[in-house]
């Protein structure tokens, strides 16, 4: 076809200077020489479709997909990626070729896929297809451990499907409550996968590799403890193993334990019992309920009964998919400059979430604390009284959750001024957002009390760095005030601050700051 333009497709690799994620049509990075991607006409396709050679990119690498079109006249274009249209701005190089670029900064899995470029020239329409994939990378992971029964033995095996293969340890504690904290002397750690001593008060298995440490607690009902005010609840996903331990201590061996699901005895093979005498000659019995791979019909109330203790129950809920339940409505807070304050998010989630707090594009570690009612809470106190937008982000295998917070710090306005030949502007970031007054200083008004109302324009703008509001006021210069000193004042409920500006002809402008409480 004579009308077909000459097309060249190239890949430009950029050496990252720690650029942020995004797409644009300019690239302020060091670039390597372009690599020709061929761009051959695709046979047997409806319409004119050019296909570039497949592009494999390292994770976090930055690239530009570029098309050079040798066709007369103007061109217009449109990029399409995953059914979304992306902005396209063609320009012309020194050889008068049309140049269309797509910049991918810090490549991630979400940016991999097919990029379609639709080009319309005066002569014809055509499509160019780029396929971008991430280079085969192994993903090191750390997953929460789970339990399995050891074949033909009354023992638990702790498994964490992680790479590098983690160091597995059992964390055992025989005290109650606070004394079972990680570094307490009551805590014993055993660096092994199999645990035979299953009578302890608190049993956890932890797995650690260079990505961190993840722990799973053996869910326990203790018949000698007062039941919780709210029924304990255990969530599991279909296919996961279920383990519940029922524990009871009695003065002698004359008692037995049984498990029921919704008033029906558990089938044999779904429980096993162990017993031992404690140091004071009392008998400890434990009865495990376990299902190696749960299904929806394993949902329900699991009740442990004893002939010598009141029975206790736990609600086991089997879900198809993980979830994060929390209110995602944004919250605004207004605090004083030295007031102690923490953001907090209360949520219920399964599997356990990973979370981050973000402020001004910087991420902070996120700690979670379990509450008695099955909810968890994450608090963030490290805001250092910086106003702006704070983001809580949580995700697990199946769900994502984001919540926005705005922090406003009550403070007296601080005024900054700038001037040009035609106007003077004042800016302030005090909170609550200040109101403005402009005053003219003259022989008649040496204390600058003569108010200016003409030519004043006030606005508030979002300062992008912190998501914090800045108020500004601009005075358009008129002959009546040229050569005079003017004063702009910002005031709110906490005080007033002013700047004095000399409105002379263009040149350096002296500013006199004037703080009034």
């Amino acid at each position: 076809n004579q009308d077909l333009p000459v097309i060249k497709c190239v890949l430009i690799n950029h050496k990252n200077n720690d650029s942020s994620v995004g797409k644009s049509s300019s690239y302020p990075m060091v670039s390597e020489s372009p690599e020709d991607l061929g761009c051959a006409l695709r046979p047997q396709s409806s319409g004119t479709v050019y296909e570039a050679a497949a592009v494999e990119v390292d994770v976090s690498a930055s690239i530009t997909l570029q098309v050079l079109v040798d066709a007369p006249g103007n061109i217009s274009c449109l990029w399409v990626f995953k059914h979304s249209s992306l902005n396209c701005q063609p320009h012309f190089d020194l050889q008068n070729r049309g140049v269309v670029s797509m910049v991918i900064l810090k490549m991630t899995e979400t940016q991999a896929g097919e990029y379609l470029l639709f080009i319309q020239s005066e002569a014809t329409n055509y499509t160019i297809l780029f396929t971008v994939s991430i280079r085969n990378t192994l993903l090191y992971t750390l997953r929460r451990p789970y339990f399995r029964k050891m074949e033909n033995q009354d023992a638990l095996v702790c498994i964490s499907e992680s790479v590098p293969e983690p160091i597995v340890e059992w964390v055992l504690c025989d005290s109650q409550g606070e004394s079972c904290k990680e570094e307490s002397p009551a805590v014993v750690k055993k660096e092994e996968k199999v645990l035979h001593e299953l009578f302890g008060t608190d049993i956890r298995c932890c797995a650690r590799n260079e990505l961190g440490r993840e722990c799973t607690r053996l869910f326990t009902i203790d018949l000698n403890q007062t039941p919780q005010t709210t029924l304990p609840q255990l969530f599991l996903k279909v296919g996961e193993p279920l383990w519940i331990r029922c524990k009871a201590v009695h003065v002698n061996h004359g008692f037995g334990l049984t498990w029921e699901l919704e008033n029906k005895a558990l089938e044999e093979g779904n429980y096993f019992e162990m017993s031992t005498y404690s140091t004071n000659r009392t008998m400890i019995r434990i009865l495990f309920a376990f299902v190696s791979s749960v299904a929806r019909n394993d949902t329900g109330y699991y009740t442990c009964s004893s002939s010598k203790h009141p029975s206790q129950s736990a609600l086991v809920t089997i879900v198809e998919k993980g979830f994060i339940n929390a209110t995602n409505s944004s919250e605004d807070y207004e605090i004083d400059q030295y007031e102690e304050f923490c953001f907090s998010v209360r949520f219920k989630a399964y599997p356990q979430i990973r979370c981050t707090w973000t402020f001004s594009r910087k991420s902070f570690p996120c700690e979670q604390k379990g509450l008695d009612n099955g909810y968890s809470i994450s608090k963030f106190c490290n805001h250092k009284h910086q106003p702006g937008e704070y983001i809580f982000h949580a995700e697990n295998d199946d769900a994502q959750f984001t919540k926005m917070f705005t922090l406003n710090i009550r403070r007296k306005p601080q005024v900054l001024a700038e001037a040009s030949a035609s106007q003077a502007s004042c800016f302030s970031d005090g909170y609550p957002l200040p109101s403005w007054t402009w005053k003219k200083c003259s022989d008649k008004s040496p204390n600058c009390t003569e108010e200016i109302t003409e030519g004043v324009w006030n606005r508030k703008a979002n300062r992008k760095v912190f998501g914090q509001w800045v108020s500004s006021s601009t005075l358009n210069m008129s002959e009546a005030i040229k050569g005079f000193l003017v004063k702009c004042c910002a005031y709110n409920s906490l005080g007033t601050s002013c700047e004095t500006i000399l409105l002379n002809s263009p040149g350096p402008f002296p500013f006199i700051q004037d703080n009034i409480s």
């Epitope: 720690d18 280079r135 990378t137 192994l138 993903l139 992971t141 750390l142 260079e210 570690p365 295998d397």
Partner: antibody
């Protein structure tokens, strides 16, 4: 460009201590796990230790466990190896190497891993009386 | 600990030869294996990661294969600059372990 530069090597008597440093540049240091690897004269490579991206998890070869400590200062883009109770068999060229890059995939924290893809030039430690 | 046994420990070959080096793990390491090249007085250089993926900037005459316990590094046509020592590394579990090395010398 991406670079690792080791320093702190030297001659030291058995039983004494030495601290090696590795200055990183050209990449986001705080997003990567970091390793120390050593090579005794005329011998093969031996992995020594690794530290996680934020510095809270360390793992060691059995031969150095309890004597060596790996640490990092992300604000200074620097990796360290504190070597105590040094022995003659610790004599080697010590290399620092970049490990995996942190990511989060469906709530599971992970490292993209190309292997130890960037190495320093090495610093020599000689333990001799 | 996982032992990595590399063979041969040394070999002599000529420019243009096809060279094969093997690495055997004492237990399965999936594809968590890398191959490195080291020249005298220099730091090791990553050639292959994930058992078979070619590191960026490495010539295509180098290739890796295998998974589980048996792995191979192949140089399809040996070039003068390829005379060096080659090491495999498993990073499936701690401690990470290197093979003993294979020295490729000029015949």
């Amino acid at each position: 460009q991406v670079q690792l530069v080791e320093s702190g090597g030297g001659v030291v008597q058995p039983g004494r201590s030495l601290r090696l440093s590795c200055a990183a540049s050209g990449f986001t240091f705080s997003s990567y796990g970091m390793h120390w690897v050593r090579q005794a004269p005329g011998k093969g490579l031996e992995w020594v230790a690794v530290i996680s991206y934020e510095g809270s998890n360390e793992f060691y070869a059995e031969s150095v466990k309890g004597r060596f400590t790996i640490s990092r200062d992300n604000s200074k883009n620097t990796l360290y190896l504190q070597m105590n109770s040094l022995r003659a068999e610790d004599t080697a060229v010590y290399y620092c190497a970049r490990g995996g890059e942190i990511t989060m995939v469906r709530g599971v924290i992970g490292y993209y891993y190309y292997g130890m893809d960037v190495w320093g030039q090495g610093t020599t430690v000689t333990v001799s009386s | 600990d996982i032992q990595m046994t590399q063979s041969p420990s040394s070999l002599s070959a000529s420019v243009g030869d096809r060279v094969t080096i093997t690495c055997r793990a004492s237990q399965s390491i999936s594809s968590y294996l890398n191959w490195y090249q080291q020249k005298p007085g220099k730091a090791p250089k990553l050639l292959i990661y994930a058992a078979s993926s070619l590191q960026s900037g490495v010539p295509s005459r180098f290739s890796g294969s295998g998974s589980g316990t048996e792995f191979t590094l192949t140089i399809s046509s040996l070039q003068p600059e390829d005379f060096a020592t080659y090491y495999c590394l498993q990073h499936n579990s701690y401690p990470l372990t290197f093979g003993g090395g294979t020295k490729v010398e000029i015949k």
